[in-house]
Amino acid sequence: GWVWNQFFVPEEMNTTSHHVGRLRSDLDNGNNSFQYKLLGAGAGSTFIIDERTGDIYAIEKLDREERSLYILRAQVIDITTGRAVEPESEFVIKVSDINDNEPKFLDEPYEAIVPEMSPEGTLVIQVTASDADDPSSGNNARLLYSLLQGQPYFSVEPTTGVIRISSKMDRELQDEYWVIIQAKDMIGQPGALSGTTSVLIKLSDVNDNKPIFKESLYRLTVSESAPTGTSIGTIMAYDNDIGENAEMDYSIEEDDSQTFDIITNHETQEGIVILKKKVNFEHQNHYGIRAKVKNHHVDEQLMKYHTEASTTFIKIQVEDVDEPPLFLLPYYIFEIFEETPQGSFVGVVSATDPDNRKSPIRYSITRSKVFNIDDNGTITTTNSLDREISAWYNLSITATEKYNIEQISSIPVYVQVLNINDHAPEFSQYYESYVCENAGSGQVIQTISAVDRDESIEEHHFYFNLSVEDTNSSSFTIIDNQDNTAVILTNRTGFNLQEEPIFYISILIADNGIPSLTSTNTLTIHVCDCDDSGSTQTCQYQELMLSMGFKTE
């Protein structure tokens, strides 16, 4: 049978040939009658065999990491017979390892993110090096990890390559660290090979900083003419955190006047001071408000960093605006009796300059020929007034600052002209009546009514009478209906168209004013020729009357 020991050949041997071992048959008596042959991958190129002795030689430098074993076949032939002495057999040549490979970090580049302020022992990342040497052969591939750069913030577990935090870090001081890790084989013993890698460790932000006002005092100004909602200025706090952790909300901590508000611009993280109520320089010319700022999002476990909100004081100066004069009342109503003489007193309007300088005021009346106003605001008449022409006057009074004529205010002034009894009552219309020649006594000829241009304080009451002459000699009589109307009746039987075709009756109408006024009104009565029924008028003056547009019915 075949006789051999296990074959080993060290890698990386520089000699031209290296004796590996010897193959032989136990039938070989050493008389050189056997011929040994080597077959398989590497036979003849990497390994050769001494055909006579069976000694195997490596003729090439070997690299275990390229190929760690060779499987070859051996044959032995009897030269004399040419027949195989032993059956062909497979054998193995193992390439034995030397420490010719340094550890390599294959997953580079390494990058890790860890929250700032993480406690000691927090796992950051695990780095792993590979050593191509034989892990089963001694310590050639047994690695130890160590930290070359990154103390005192980081540490590495020597056997696992796990990087941990060894000291708390503040992102606001330094936001990233380069850590250099070394891996050594031979468990660090002499002759060890090493490899290094860099790890970029970035600190993610936690909300460990509250926003703080850099300015303890802000000074803003607001015009007293500014409408509510006006932005009067901005304030700004700074937060060393980033992103969501730097988002902040501004609010008013103290403003007894409740005149201002603060809204947050979430894009710029500024506080905008807003006018909530209109200000008046003459009432209050400066304001003080205290503003505070807080983070928008704060985790419960980070509340210790946010106990006391940062505050700032804002001094707001109100800017004076020259305002127009201010009338004491929004409008005035005055009364004056009609027929009072020119220059009569109507009333007084009053306006003042609301500004601090208290400019004198000048008054004027827009487009009025009837009234005048002086610099004291006293309104007088320039003409006698007639209520029956105009009972009310709507005036526009203008007040102008003496020192700034552009500052103008106007208000309406209503003047009521009060009635005096200066008009007697009179016929409400023109009356023209007729009476039939054959009319009997007591026949109603006409109902009359009166009007009075004066205003009635309670109700007008008119009194109707015939004139003294007509009362004594009249063919007609009058009855007062006590309702501001009266009826004219015949006072005799029969009239003669030829003798007396027209009667002119003077009617006295008196009012109930104090003193009472009376007017004399003439009623014209035509005598007509009527048929028996009294309905057909064949009146001498009928055509005349009709052409004038009068009806006689």
Epitope: R219, D256, S257, E282, Q284, N285, Y287, G288, F313, K315
Partner: antibody, heavy 119, light 107 residues
Framework: QVQLVESGGGVVQPGRSLRLSCAAS????????MHWVRQAPGKGLEWVAV????????YYADSVKGRFTISRDTSKNTLYLQMNSLRAEDTAVYYC????????????WGQGTLVSVSS | EIVLTQSPGTLSLSPGERATLSCRAS???????LAWYHQRPGQAPRLLIY???SRATGIPDRFSGSGSGTDFALTISSLEPEDFAVYYC????????FGQGTKVEIK
Amino acid sequence: QVQLVESGGGVVQPGRSLRLSCAASGFTFSSYDMHWVRQAPGKGLEWVAVISYDGTNEYYADSVKGRFTISRDTSKNTLYLQMNSLRAEDTAVYYCARERYFDWSFDYWGQGTLVSVSS
Amino acid sequence: EIVLTQSPGTLSLSPGERATLSCRASQSVSNTYLAWYHQRPGQAPRLLIYGASSRATGIPDRFSGSGSGTDFALTISSLEPEDFAVYYCQQYSNSWTFGQGTKVEIK
């Protein structure tokens, strides 16, 4: 320490002019609003004028409006009061005062300078 | 303008006694914008109280201020010899006006 020292007072005839100065030290002059206050002999205090920290705003009491002008020179740390058309009733000790940073009261006063207006 | 009226005009007290000075405003003083000063003869006024009740720097705690709206008071809990002076209230809600003063004299 904060110091305010007034100067420029004296006797002046009615209708004439006078300029008072107030030298400030011991604080950041440009950060504070400054005032003038006067006190007639044997009488109480009367506020006269104020100028804002940056000199952009001035306000006056009605009694001096149009006649007095308040100003400041930050490079010299000095406050001024220019008094024109002086009247007998302007006779008083004139004090300059610093307005509190977080308030409108007067936390520091000078010792005052006397202005006498008489013919 | 806001008119301040102080009372009494003169207060005669002995050292160690309690002094209460009153200041009344003609209209409400916003945000308690009221200060108290004292003035010794020949000296400049000195700020005692601001914001109606806050003591100024270096002012002893025997001085206290109170009030709001239109009625304010300055109390000196126990008069010291150096406290005998003229006391002025001042409003700074709208412009600046002073009261006419209260003289605290030794009885």
